[in-house]
């Protein structure tokens, strides 16, 4: 079995986690993809997922999580905005491929969110130009409930901060001021 590894990434409250999960284009371009959190002794919990089939470059927002799947690049971009200390925990991207088990995209991210936002006076995490405008009807995709029980045995030690994850939609103000697609060449 492939050894599961993780990388620690530390941010402050109010900042944005912005990661890119690679996948094999030929196999998984239109597959449904998800962002999960792994709690101690529990199955990975899906926080957000793309549509099924996954739409190219179509932002999906679930609360403070935004997913964008770039089929041409084999890349799922995940953003968690306005981070809170309670968001600390172990995260992973997976690809749903029923009836088979979800395929995990390496590596897992050990997110550590600390108190105290480091912005300069007058700066705004949400201020940007030439943003990608998310339509008012941004999709909230339905995510499959199943998760591989096999991954439970591989759950890592509990992180220092307990993780609370919203099951319901969280209102995110000015989301159109946060998201901008990469300028792919």
């Amino acid at each position: 079995a492939t050894k599961l590894t993780e990388e620690k990434y530390e941010l402050k409250e109010g900042q944005t986690l912005d990661v890119k999960c690679d996948y094999t284009l030929e196999k998984f371009a239109s597959s449904q993809k998800a962002w999960q959190i792994i709690r101690d002794g529990e199955m990975p919990k899906t926080l957000a997922c793309t549509e099924r089939p996954s739409k190219n470059s179509h932002p999906v927002q679930v609360g403070r999580i935004i997913l964008e799947d770039y089929h041409d690049h084999g890349l799922l971009r995940v953003r968690m905005v306005n981070l809170q200390v309670e968001d600390s925990g172990l995260y992973q991207c997976v690809i749903y491929q029923p009836p088979k088990e979800p395929h995990m995209l390496f590596d897992r991210i050990r997110l550590v969110v600390t108190k105290g936002f480091s912005g300069t006076p007058g700066s705004n995490e949400n201020s940007t130009q030439n943003v990608y405008k998310i339509p008012p009807t941004t999709t909230k995709a339905l995510c499959p409930l199943y998760t591989s029980p096999r991954t439970v045995t591989q759950a890592p030690p509990k992180s220092t901060a307990d993780v609370s994850t919203p099951d319901s939609e969280i209102n995110l103000t000015n989301v159109t001021d946060i998201i901008r697609v990469p300028v792919f060449n």
């Epitope: 990434y9 912005d18 094999t24």
Partner: antibody
Framework: EVQLLESGGGMVQPGGSLRLSCAVS????????MSWVRQAPGKGLEWVSE????????YYADSVKGRFTISRDNSKNTLYLQMNSLRVEDTAIYYC????????????WGQGTLVTVSS | EIVMTQSPATLSVSPGERATLSCRAS??????LAWYQQKPGQAPRLLIY???TRATGIPARFSGSGSGTEFTLTISSLQSEDFAVYYC??????????FGQGTKVEIK
């Protein structure tokens, strides 16, 4: 211990070609995006190219697009940069760098290899 | 492409003094900013990522702050080994990753 070791640099005439290699160890090479970053003598850092891990997608700076090709051999834990139609302005130290935490920033760098393009 | 501008180009500081380096982005990069240190004849070394998080093994005298378009790297008390060139890099709007032109911190 993570190590990146570049090779293949040297002197070449304008219009010529070179192939740089970067042998890596200490991490699971196939999982990580890798980049080439260059530095002209006495100048700053310039990102040149990136190749993603699982997808194999490639990206290039406008200054090298169509002339340089990035590739990797996961079985050999090696990253490559094929440089064709070299110009005087391509003269630089070329570093290979490992991506950190699924983001396009770099936590490990090689020592660099010097490419000199001169007639 | 996002343009990163660093100032000053050269900073002359005495050992033990505080050094403040600035980096400005042409448009918002949120907190997706890193700082690197490069000494003569060496490869760059990651100091700060996420605008304010010290990379593994980086001393506490290095601190980063800012978000959006304005960022600062502060070295609280310069040691002899800190005299080097410092680069900021944005990794928000990718590709390309863009670096600032660098700030050289020299002994006064």
């Amino acid at each position: 211990e993570v190590q990146l070791l570049e090779s293949g640099g040297g002197m070449v005439q304008p219009g010529g070609s070179l192939r740089l290699s970067c042998a890596v160890s200490g991490f699971t090479f196939s999982r990580y995006a890798m980049s080439w970053v260059r530095q002209a003598p006495g100048k700053g850092l310039e990102w040149v190219s990136e190749m993603r891990g699982s997808s194999g997608s490639t990206y290039y700076a406008d200054s090298v697009k169509g002339r340089f090709t990035i590739s990797r051999d996961n079985s050999k834990n090696t990253l490559y940069l094929q440089m064709n139609s070299l110009r005087v302005e391509d003269t630089a130290i070329y570093y290979c760098a490992k991506e950190f935490s699924s983001n396009s920033l770099f936590d490990y760098w090689g020592q660099g290899t010097l490419v000199t393009v001169s007639s | 492409e996002i343009v990163m501008t660093q100032s000053p180009a050269t900073l002359s500081v005495s050992p033990g003094e505080r050094a403040t380096l600035s980096c400005r982005a042409s448009q918002s990069v949120n907190s997706n900013l890193a700082w690197y240190q490069q000494k003569p004849g060496q490869a760059p070394r990651l100091l700060i990522y996420g605008a304010s998080t010290r990379a593994t093994g980086i001393p506490a005298r290095f601190s980063g702050s800012g978000s959006g378009t304005e960022f600062t790297l502060t070295i609280s008390s310069l040691q002899s080994e800190d005299f080097a060139v410092y680069y900021c890099q944005q990794f928000y709007n990718w590709p390309p990753n863009t670096f600032g032109q660098g700030t050289k911190v020299e002994i006064k």
